[in-house]
């Protein structure tokens, strides 16, 4: 997990205090028990939530070293429909497996410019970034 | 959405550039079509994802003005089991409705101290904060 260069350093102030990192080491924000292997359209009876779900999903890494957090994970549904609760192995077309989206706050590293327009290190720019969190088994919409 | 006081201001540098907010106005990070009303243990055939899910959930606001983002939403499951795809109303004990957790990166506003220990405005401290994102219908774990 790389640390960024100092954020908008300015004379007489220790740059490393401008964006104070947690004193606890922060690992990549990887979903717990993430398993990219042996994923298929079936609901397991053990393992992490994304593999036991009847709308199972895998995670796809989205890494950007100029963004905080640098690592985001996007859910990708493994089945178009929900898997049967009876067997965990075949689909039930009465339910759809749909992505749940969320607009997450992220910060981008951008060059800062002083009053005279000269480059003054880096600033953080706050943005909303759309991530897919999970796949959810839903009843299909009834069109009126 | 209140703006924070300047982040670690220092002489000769415009403090509002230290943490540059997006030029686009940012509304509270409220889940799309959030509806706190008429939520119950049933899967609707219309409305937002959290009400159409067979593991329906509601959202609970968690506001902290000294944190970025200031508003976070925690999912709360409305049913212990999944709702039947056939009826959308009665529960099917073959499936459990389980919370999906995520460690989200947040930033806390903390007082900054200069080399001499004097108060020098505010710094951002990065932390992981556990939020529940959604409720997912899963097959129960089989104990070996």
């Amino acid at each position: 997990y790389s640390h960024w260069p100092s954020c908008c350093p300015s004379k007489g102030y220790p740059s490393e205090e401008l964006l104070r990192w947690s004193t606890v080491p922060v690992p990549p924000l990887k979903p717990a028990s993430l398993d990219f292997h042996s994923v298929s359209c079936r609901a397991s009876e053990d393992g992490p939530l994304n593999s036991r779900a009847i709308s199972p999903w895998r995670y796809e890494l989205d890494r950007d070293l100029n963004r905080l957090p640098q690592d985001l994970y996007h859910a990708r549904c493994l089945c178009p429909h929900c898997v049967s609760l009876q067997t965990g192995s075949h689909m039930d077309p009465r339910g759809n497996s749909e992505l749940l989206y969320h607009n997450q706050t992220v910060f981008y590293r951008r060059p800062c410019h002083g009053k005279k327009g000269n480059h003054k290190g880096y600033c953080l720019e706050r943005r909303l970034y759309r991530v897919s969190l999970a796949c959810v088994c839903v009843r299909p919409r009834v069109m009126g | 959405y209140s703006h924070w006081p300047s982040c670690c201001p220092s002489k000769g540098y415009p403090s509002e550039e230290l943490l540059r907010w997006s030029t686009v106005p940012v509304p509270p990070l409220k889940p799309a079509s959030l509806d706190f009303h008429s939520v119950s243990c049933r899967a609707s055939e219309d409305g937002p994802l959290n009400s159409r899910a067979i593991s329906p959930w509601r959202y609970e606001l968690d506001r902290d003005l000294n944190r970025l983002p200031q508003d976070l939403y925690h999912a709360r499951c409305l049913c212990p089991h999944c709702v039947s795809l056939q009826t959308g109303s009665h529960m099917d004990p073959r499936g459990n409705s389980e919370l999906l957790y995520h460690n989200q990166t947040v930033f806390y506003r903390r007082p900054c101290h200069g080399k001499k220990g004097n108060h020098k405005g505010y710094c951002l401290e990065r932390r992981l904060y556990r939020v529940s994102l959604a409720c997912v219908c899963v097959r129960p774990r089989v104990m070996g």
Partner: antibody
Framework: QVQLQESGPGLVKPSETLSLTCTVS????????WSWIRQPPGKGLEWIGF???????NYNPSLKSRVTISVDTSKNQFSLKLSSVTAADTAVYYC???????????????WGQGTLVTVSS | DIQMTQSPSSLSASVGDRVTITCRAS??????LNWYQQKPGKAPKLLIY???SLQSGVPSRFSGSGSGTDFTLTISSLQPEDFATYYC?????????FGGGTKVEIK
């Protein structure tokens, strides 16, 4: 009226693979849970597994590592392969149609007449 | 796995008798229970599905009841052709499991 007929060798050597075929006549092979069930001599019934819509399979965990059930829609047949057999696999093997009720396997009807497979050297 | 326990394992009865066979599941299976009849050297035949529904072509003297964990197969008036072994089977969860069987013999 749907009828099922098992075929395959009646004698298999230990450690070899048991292979049986079930031919479906008088009906479509789509949208049913084509299943195999076995019955050791003088004992009860044991479900082996199914193949649904030529794709999804589900096997009894006690046999899972050794079983494959496949469907050949062009021939209106489905088959059972059970590897690494031992004397404990000696049984009458039945093929059966698992009825699709609310997108779940519900009950078995009809059944084939059954074929005795003996595992012996 | 869900265990299915049948009782009695065998019984002797006469033609015309009312016969009751019970089946107990190790956990609640709602109404996901089926009953089969098997005669020596033959394949099982479906009698009752979904705990209480009579399969087409099966005589009305056969009936099924129960839900949850306790189920009953009743033959209201035993006929000569009813002497056979009866099995219950759950379809609530895979692996699908059968009871050990109840053999109905002539007294």
């Amino acid at each position: 009226q749907v009828q099922l007929q098992e075929s395959g060798p009646g004698l298999v050597k230990p450690s070899e693979t048991l292979s049986l075929t079930c031919t479906v006549s008088g009906g479509s092979i789509s949208n049913y849970f084509w299943s195999w069930i076995r019955q050791p001599p003088g004992k009860g019934l044991e479900w082996i597994g199914f193949n649904y819509n030529s794709g999804s399979t589900n096997y009894n965990p006690s046999l899972k590592s050794r079983v494959t059930i496949s469907v050949d829609t062009s021939k209106n047949q489905f088959s059972l392969k059970l590897s690494s057999v031992t004397a404990a696999d000696t049984a009458v093997y039945y093929c059966a149609r698992g009825y699709n009720w609310n997108y779940e396997i519900a009950w078995f009807d009809p059944w084939g007449q059954g074929t005795l497979v003996t595992v012996s050297s | 796995d869900i265990q299915m326990t049948q009782s009695p394992s065998s019984l002797s009865a006469s033609v015309g008798d009312r016969v009751t066979i019970t089946c107990r599941a190790s956990q609640s299976i709602s109404s996901y229970l089926n009953w089969y009849q098997q005669k020596p050297g033959k394949a099982p035949k479906l009698l009752i599905y979904a705990a209480s529904s009579l399969q087409s072509g099966v005589p009305s003297r056969f009936s099924g009841s129960g839900s949850g964990t306790d189920f009953t197969l009743t033959i209201s008036s035993l006929q000569p052709e009813d002497f056979a072994t009866y099995y219950c089977q759950q379809s609530y969860l895979t692996p699908l499991t059968f009871g050990g069987g109840t053999k109905v013999e002539i007294k």
